[in-house]
Interface confidence: low
Amino acid sequence: DAHKSEVAHRFKDLGEENFKALVLIAFAQYLQQCPFEDHVKLVNEVTEFAKTCVADESAENCDKSLHTLFGDKLCTVATLRETYGEMADCCAKQEPERNECFLQHKDDNPNLPRLVRPEVDVMCTAFHDNEETFLKKYLYEIARRHPYFYAPELLFFAKRYKAAFTECCQAADKAACLLPKLDELRDEGKASSAKQRLKCASLQKFGERAFKAWAVARLSQRFPKAEFAEVSKLVTDLTKVHTECCHGDLLECADDRADLAKYICENQDSISSKLKECCEKPLLEKSHCIAEVENDEMPADLPSLAADFVESKDVCKNYAEAKDVFLGMFLYEYARRHPDYSVVLLLRLAKTYETTLEKCCAAADPHECYAKVFDEFKPLVEEPQNLIKQNCELFEQLGEYKFQNALLVRYTKKVPQVSTPTLVEVSRNLGKVGSKCCKHPEAKRMPCAEDYLSVVLNQLCVLHEKTPVSDRVTKCCTESLVNRRPCFSALEVDETYVPKEFNAETFTFHADICTLSEKERQIKKQTALVELVKHKPKATKEQLKAVMDDFAAFVEKCCKADDKETCFAEEGKKLVAASQAALGL
């Protein structure tokens, strides 16, 4: 359905409010360093132009593509070269290369100041003074720090953000009402950003086929009563939505996501019995709810998979006729029977099945060759099961903070070249798998844990890609999307690593640590732990534990002292000397 004016089409479909919000998100995700006011000006100009096209689709430039219109607008920014350097070269290109160029320059770790939360009264005053600007600022700050944030979902977050301020700024105890809500939005937002980053990495680095395979597995688990054709249709539509969002086509993405939600709700009888509540909600809530909906019950009496995929004499014929369709059916059938498996495990099984058919369908006796293919699945299933069992036991024994520390040591020894802030961030997130997943019963542990670990390890991969320092990380990140976690798990201590020179400055602490929040204090201690391991990669657990216990005691003692700064200076020197002795530095 070709439209004379794409910009008018999207403006009419989305409405002015969503149109403006999505254009702001798009611009902030591309030009992450630009001041808020500059972006608002650009958005207003685009919006005014869109309105002229709504009034007359034949008006000048209204027939231009959105990439052309938006790219032209971004390229009017006066300080492009000073602020962004070589990104300015993108403006010399034509579409679609110009957009590809902008995408290439998205920065997963932009050099932006940490967002500091003002006092509640200050925030409430700002909210009341100019609600529209306040909410736009929220979209802008999140979008520029998370350049792949799923735009239609960010609109949902903004709606909840607004609701929190509307409710809490008139509450008796504003802080008690507001702060927990903001904490929840922050944590959910970080998780949402990381999940979407994996989808975009999957599409951009491993291609549409990889993403579609992931989607077949996940949707088949979620909608096990749906027919394969129905799941295939949903996968095709979902792939289009995420391809658009990951490609910066946010207006099309939001529009198509709304269409998909509409389709799912109109056809819920043939999709899932769990959608009823979601489908009664307004659009943004509806789409979010569908994306998070629990798995439907498995149909009763599903036949054994072996009949169609091992015992049938037509296996090779069916495979040869339409390889991806046949493998898709295998993945669908396996996934709908196994909500207890992680998506990445299901994809490993499908890959093993594919490899076996590739080999066996060319053999003299194909059936004899692939007859035992399901036996090859056993070790693949047991590996994550055992790993999760061991790590949940360790988590239950240590608690989250010390479990994170164990992972910090483990991962620093595996890939010591990686920057300390990245190791701390990634290991802390890996450690959260314990409190997130170990509470679940056995049947839900693996999909929770391994699919969460895929998201966290992708953070490591995208951060490392910006400044690659470790061949081992590059190898695990690029060889196979579904084997990233087993690849990292299999890494041993890097014997080629030359320990870092000891630098006392790294272990010098000041009284400001005493005023930090518990989380910030943990991060300081964990940063020191990573640095210790980088200095002494062969240090034993016991040695590191002793040093960290001494360090915790030192911080506690000096934070209670009358003259804190003197205590940190004098006791700090003693701690460094004692640590050097303990570790033989």
């Epitope: 590809e100 995408l103 951009q204 680095k205 291609g207 890609e465 190898k475």
Partner: nanobody, 116 residues
């Protein structure tokens, strides 16, 4: 260790042809989309063409459309770029890279010079 080794470049007259190859090792070649990108003297990287893992989906920049053809041989772990009707503005170092249009090259590249 991921390795991409480009070859096949050289000096050619305008209107001439060249076929570039990229030998891949250290990763599962058949599972990855691949691209060719180029860098002209004193310029940034420019995306030229991409092909998906199966080889059935190919894309080209406007500047080479109709003249260049990307292909791959998954059995040989090799990516190709057939370049016909070459122009002086095609002069550049050509690199192959893992991934789509946003891919970053990691090999040494192969020099293509189009000049009479």
């Amino acid at each position: 260790q991921v390795q991409l080794v480009e070859s096949g470049g050289g000096l050619v007259q305008p209107g001439g042809s060249l076929r570039l190859s990229c030998a891949a090792s250290g990763f599962t070649f058949r599972g990855f989309g691949m691209s060719w990108v180029r860098q002209a003297p004193g310029k940034g990287f420019e995306w030229v063409s991409s092909i998906n893992s199966g080889g059935e989906d190919t894309r080209y920049s406007d500047s080479v459309k109709g003249r260049f053809t990307i292909s791959r041989d998954n059995a040989r772990n090799t990516l190709y770029l057939q370049m016909n009707s070459l122009k002086p503005e095609d002069t550049a170092v050509y690199y192959c890279a893992i991934g789509g249009a946003g891919a970053t090259p990691s090999g040494q590249g192969t020099q293509v010079t189009v000049s009479s």
